[in-house]
């Protein structure tokens, strides 16, 4: 999906209002320096591409993020503020339902969510205006 035509400011508002709090809840008890951030993004569409990938794509050691509250709210925000996003996700959603039976918080998942926090921070405040 090409995130170029999303309403970035509306997505930012959704993040600041709710998603950020859910990420904090997920990460509670984890030190901010515990993980090295290896994923970065260069502009807002790229940030959303990386956020989508880390949030919804299963990775080795972390297959359960898609059912978390922050993930569901992220999906809702993208569906509302990115034209045509919902249609591209129908097949992916079916695959996720088969792949994810339960929510398990692993160290790998905590690391992944730490990366997500950095990506969201970058998305919200790109230094060069990327509208």
């Amino acid at each position: 999906y090409d995130f170029t035509n999303c309403d970035f400011e509306k997505i930012k508002a959704a993040y600041l209002s709710t998603i950020s709090k859910d990420l904090i809840t997920y990460m509670s008890g984890t030190k901010s320096t515990e993980f090295n951030n290896t994923v970065s993004c260069s502009n807002r569409p790229h940030c959303l591409t990386e956020i989508q990938s880390l949030t919804f794509n299963p990775t080795a050691g972390c297959a359960s993020l898609a059912k978390e509250m922050f993930a569901m709210k992220t999906k809702a925000a993208l569906a509302i503020w990115c034209p045509g996003y919902s249609e591209t996700q129908i097949n992916a959603t079916q695959a996720m339902k088969k792949a994810r039976k339960s929510k398990v918080t692993t160290n790998k998942c905590l690391e992944q969510v730490s990366q997500l926090q950095g990506l969201w921070r970058r998305f919200n405040r790109p230094l060069l205006k990327q509208q």
């Epitope: 508002a13 260069s42 950095g118 405040r125």
Partner: antibody
Framework: EVQLVQSGAEVKKPGSSVKVSCKAS????????MHWVKHAPGQGLEWIGA????????SYNQKFKDRATLTVDKSTSTAYMELSSLRSEDTAVYYC?????????????WGQGTTVTVSS | DIVLTQSPDSLAVSLGERATINCRAS??????????MHWYQQKPGQPPKLLIY???NLGSGVPDRFSGSGSGTDFTLTISSLQAEDVAVYYC?????????FGQGTKLEIK
């Protein structure tokens, strides 16, 4: 503990340059925008610019764009501000500051400040 | 650039009384229903300290006698019951539009 520690006070001659450092600890330096703010005697706060350590991208206040250069050294989690062609009105306390956790655009952690005095 | 104008420039209030500082922006600092206006307190020889973020949210560790309100172009910082340690200069700051700008500051003293 999250903190920013700046280099010590500097006395410089007009026309010279100064480079102020800001060492970060207690957080993932590469993912936070780092800002620089000027506070001249008897004046208000003035934003100089910001840098994103992840890729070195910068944003400057046009007033400082020609004379201020912001850089980072990710290996030591240190941000730098170099100010060239110094003049008397550059006499001020310079602060580095970390932008908040969420990208809201406020500064939640500040360095202790570095006093730069420009005098002949 | 968005110009932030604070009023008054200085203010003297009795201990225990209410102090109110205003900040007017030359254009709206709102975006998608959120107001990107922040308030800081600065005491002599110290760096600024965040008091209020996004117009009305209390910063970490800030006493609840401090509050913020407003939207669009007009914002207010209120100290409900002035304490001796509140003597400082107070600044508003916007980040909705680059470049980031501060108000000129309001000096708060004890009457």
């Amino acid at each position: 503990e999250v903190q920013l520690v700046q280099s010590g006070a500097e006395v410089k001659k007009p026309g010279s340059s100064v480079k102020v450092s800001c060492k970060a600890s207690g957080f993932t330096f590469s993912t936070y925008n780092m800002h620089w703010v000027k506070h001249a005697p008897g004046q208000g706060l003035e934003w100089i610019g910001a840098i994103y350590p992840g890729n070195g991208e910068t944003s400057y206040n046009q007033k400082f764009k020609d004379r201020a250069t912001l850089t980072v050294d990710k290996s030591t989690s240190t941000a730098y501000m170099e100010l060239s062609s110094l003049r008397s009105e550059d006499t001020a306390v310079y602060y580095c500051a970390r932008e908040d956790d969420y990208g809201e655009g406020y500064f939640d952690v500040w360095g202790q400040g570095t006093t730069v005095t420009v005098s002949s | 650039d968005i110009v932030l104008t604070q009023s008054p420039d200085s203010l003297a209030v009795s201990l225990g009384e209410r102090a109110t500082i205003n900040c007017r922006a030359s254009e709206s600092v709102d975006n998608s229903g959120l107001s990107f206006m922040h308030w800081y307190q600065q005491k002599p020889g110290q760096p600024p300290k965040l008091l209020i973020y996004r117009a009305s949210n209390l910063g970490s560790g800030v006493p609840d006698r401090f509050s913020g309100s407003g939207s669009g172009t007009d914002f207010t910082l209120t100290i409900s019951s002035l304490q001796a340690e509140d003597v400082a200069v107070y600044y508003c700051q916007q980040i909705n539009t680059d470049p980031l700008t501060f108000g000129q500051g309001t000096k708060l003293e004890i009457k």
